[in-house]
Interface confidence: low
């Protein structure tokens, strides 16, 4: 069998969106089956065409329609004859357009008046490519042969560019990049005490707007008064935004603020925040516990305990917990130095212990106070060896 | 003044072909993309679609490739929206725009400042 | 295909503060837009570039972006300002444009 590439060229060059129709004329065989191949892939065409010539003389077609450039490359058909592959001469297929870009401006954040660089490429066929770059609708600067570097002194306001290309065949045009302004950030807002104790308390907040720029750090900074003395300030990295303050005293009114800095500097602080640190669990356990036997039960006295510092505020009410060792338990919550035991089994040892309780919890618990199943009244001290505590 | 003109509402059966236009005026045609927004009854708005008249480059929003062209004719400073078989889905309201900045190099204008007062395209049986 | 996403409806009383939000993946690095449309007309531009109020804008209307939420805050509100609320960007490699779905805001 004879192949042949008919009415073409080694090399055929063609505008993008033309169409192309290779011809395979193939003589020596009756209905070939000819395959067009390209780059080594055979080609899956629809539109391939055979029309018979004589009864051993066929054509082939392969009809693109619109050629784009992903069609260029190197052609050839084939046919199967005896077990073997023929193949013909190739073509080199070559689609022609307006640029395409391989590189187009990206959008940007600098700070003003800072120097920067956008690039833009483009590439044939046909060759060779040249870029006119815009600043918004103003042409900036003669053609310059692809790949083009613009170099900008700088901005003062967000500024729009583009790049143009041009070859034999057009124009094509770039995205627009769009070259942000940083900008100091805006204020933090949200922000909240979030866990508090007696000398920590743990702050999150929301950054506001970076100004287009990586925020860096904030700064927390706590007085005991709004606008008073700096008690502390808390340079923090971030993310995440929080903070934890330490070594707070208790019982005590601050107010703190939150600024987040970027490259450019520190954002307006945010409104000031007030908080209150917890005061301090009593210090003293209540003495002096003793029970005293009735008809109607059990009476138990204590003294009452004295606030030993301010920062433990008011103290009361008294928690009074008691156990027996056939395991019946119970705590009550009392708002005097006396309490009236009810629901107790005579019978079995009985162990009392009490403490005082502020806002923020209670205190120590006192020696326990043991009354035994035969005593008429208990007696502070040790617990009886059979009772576990 | 800035003016975008566009055609006048239309009824049409389902596979019927359609093209509408916007003309321009009281700026430089070739300097502006011009974009076509959908608005079906009821609905919200869709971006369809823009080109720049200069260079006759086209977007197209994903859900519009293929089903609609968008085009202009630069001696006559119009854009045409156009469809080859239009569906009852079609139904809407069309928007020509012209975006507030001079993008004339970009791809996608910035926003949009200038609206024509739509132009009503029903699709029906 | 890029989506942004907003409510389908606020409600606020005659001076409250109203919040329109409007979320995408490609909002920290493109800017959001909000359009105001009435019914029957064609919409109108209410805030560019994340913040900045469009001419003839009343100052109640302000806008403001972080992270991937864009917002539209109008202080204030009142019955002229009920209509619906779009809100406009890019996706991210700026091929094409998105109106989100819309907002419609009633002023009670």
């Known amino acids: 069998a004879g192949l042949k590439l008919m009415g073409a060229p080694v090399k055929l060059t063609v505008s993008q969106g033309q169409p192309v129709k290779l011809n395979c004329s193939v003589e020596g065989m009756e209905e070939p089956d000819i395959q067009w191949v390209k780059d080594g892939a055979v080609v899956q065409n629809l539109d391939q065409l055979y029309i018979p010539v004589s009864e051993q003389h066929w054509i082939g077609f392969l009809s693109l329609k619109s050629v784009e450039r992903s069609d260029a490359g190197r052609y050839w058909c084939q046919v199967e004859d005896g077990g073997e592959t023929e193949i013909s001469q190739p073509v080199w297929l070559t689609v022609e357009g307006v640029p395409f870009f391989t590189v187009e401006p990206k959008d940007l954040a600098v700070p003003p008046n800072a120097p920067f660089q956008l690039s833009c490429e483009a590439v044939g066929p046909p060759e060779p490519v040249t870029i006119v770059w815009w600043r918004g609708t103003t042409k900036i600067g003669g053609p310059a042969p692809s790949p083009s570097v613009l170099n900008v002194t700088g901005v003062t306001q967000s500024t729009m560019f583009s790049c143009e290309a041009h070859n034999l065949k057009g124009l094509a045009s770039s995205r627009t990049a769009t070259v942000h302004l940083q900008a100091l950030p805006a204020a933090p807002f949200n922000i909240t005490v979030t866990k508090l104790s007696s000398s920590n308390a743990s702050v999150a907040w929301m950054p506001g707007a970076d100004g287009r720029a990586l925020l860096q750090s904030c700064t927390v900074q706590v007085t005991q008064a709004p606008g008073g003395w700096e008690v502390l300030a808390v340079v923090v990295p971030v993310p995440p935004f929080t903070c934890l303050l330490r070594d707070l005293v208790p019982a005590t009114n601050y107010s703190l603020r939150v600024r987040c800095a970027n490259a450019l500097g520190p954002s307006p602080y945010a409104d000031w925040v007030p908080f209150q640190t917890k005061g301090l669990a009593p210090a003293s356990a209540p003495q002096n516990l003793h029970a005293i036997r009735t008809d109607s039960g059990l009476i138990l006295e204590w003294e009452e305990v004295i606030p030993e510092a301010p920062l433990e505020g008011p103290l009361g009410p008294y928690k009074l917990s008691w156990v027996q060792d056939n395991g019946t338990q119970d705590e009550l919550t009392v708002e005097g130095t006396r309490a009236n035991l009810t629901g107790w089994d005579p019978q079995k040892d009985l162990i009392v212990r009490v403490c005082v309780s502020n806002a923020v919890g209670c205190g120590p618990w006192s020696q326990p106070l043991v009354v035994s199943s035969h005593d008429r009244a208990g007696q502070q001290g040790p617990p009886h060896s059979r009772t576990s505590w | 003044e800035v003016q975008l003109v566009q055609s006048g509402a239309d009824v049409k059966k389902p596979g019927a072909s359609l093209t509408i236009s916007c003309q321009a005026s009281?700026?430089?045609?070739?300097?502006?993309?011009i974009s076509w927004v959908r608005q079906k009854p009821g609905k919200g708005l869709e971006w369809m679609g823009q080109i720049v008249p200069r260079a006759s480059r086209t977007n197209y929003g994903p859900s519009f490739q293929g089903h609609v062209t968008i085009s202009a004719d630069r001696s006559t400073a119009t854009a045409y929206l156009q469809w080859r078989s239009l569906e009852a889905s079609d139904t809407a309201m069309y928007y020509c725009v012209r975006p507030y900045f001079q993008t004339s190099g970009g791809t996608i204008p910035e926003y949009y400042q200038h609206w024509g007062p739509g132009t009503l395209v029903t699709v029906s049986s | 295909s890029y989506e942004l996403t907003q409510p389908p409806s606020v409600s606020v009383s005659p001076g409250q503060t109203a919040r329109i939000t409007c979320s995408g993946d490609?909002?920290?690095?493109?800017?959001a837009y909000w359009y105001q449309q009435k019914s029957g007309q064609a919409p109108v531009l209410v805030i560019y570039e994340d913040e900045k109020r469009a001419s003839g804008i009343p100052e109640r209307f302000s806008g403001s972006s972080s992270g991937t939420m864009a917002t539209l805050t109008i202080s204030g509100a009142q019955v002229e300002d009920e209509a619906d609320y779009y809100c406009?960007?890019?996706?991210?490699?700026?091929?094409?444009?998105?109106f989100g779905g819309g907002t419609k805001l009633t002023v009670l």
């Open positions: 406009y960007s890019q996706e991210r490699n700026g091929n094409y444009a998105v």
């Open positions: 009281g700026y430089t045609f070739t300097d502006y993309w």
């Open positions: 490609a909002l920290p690095k493109k800017y």
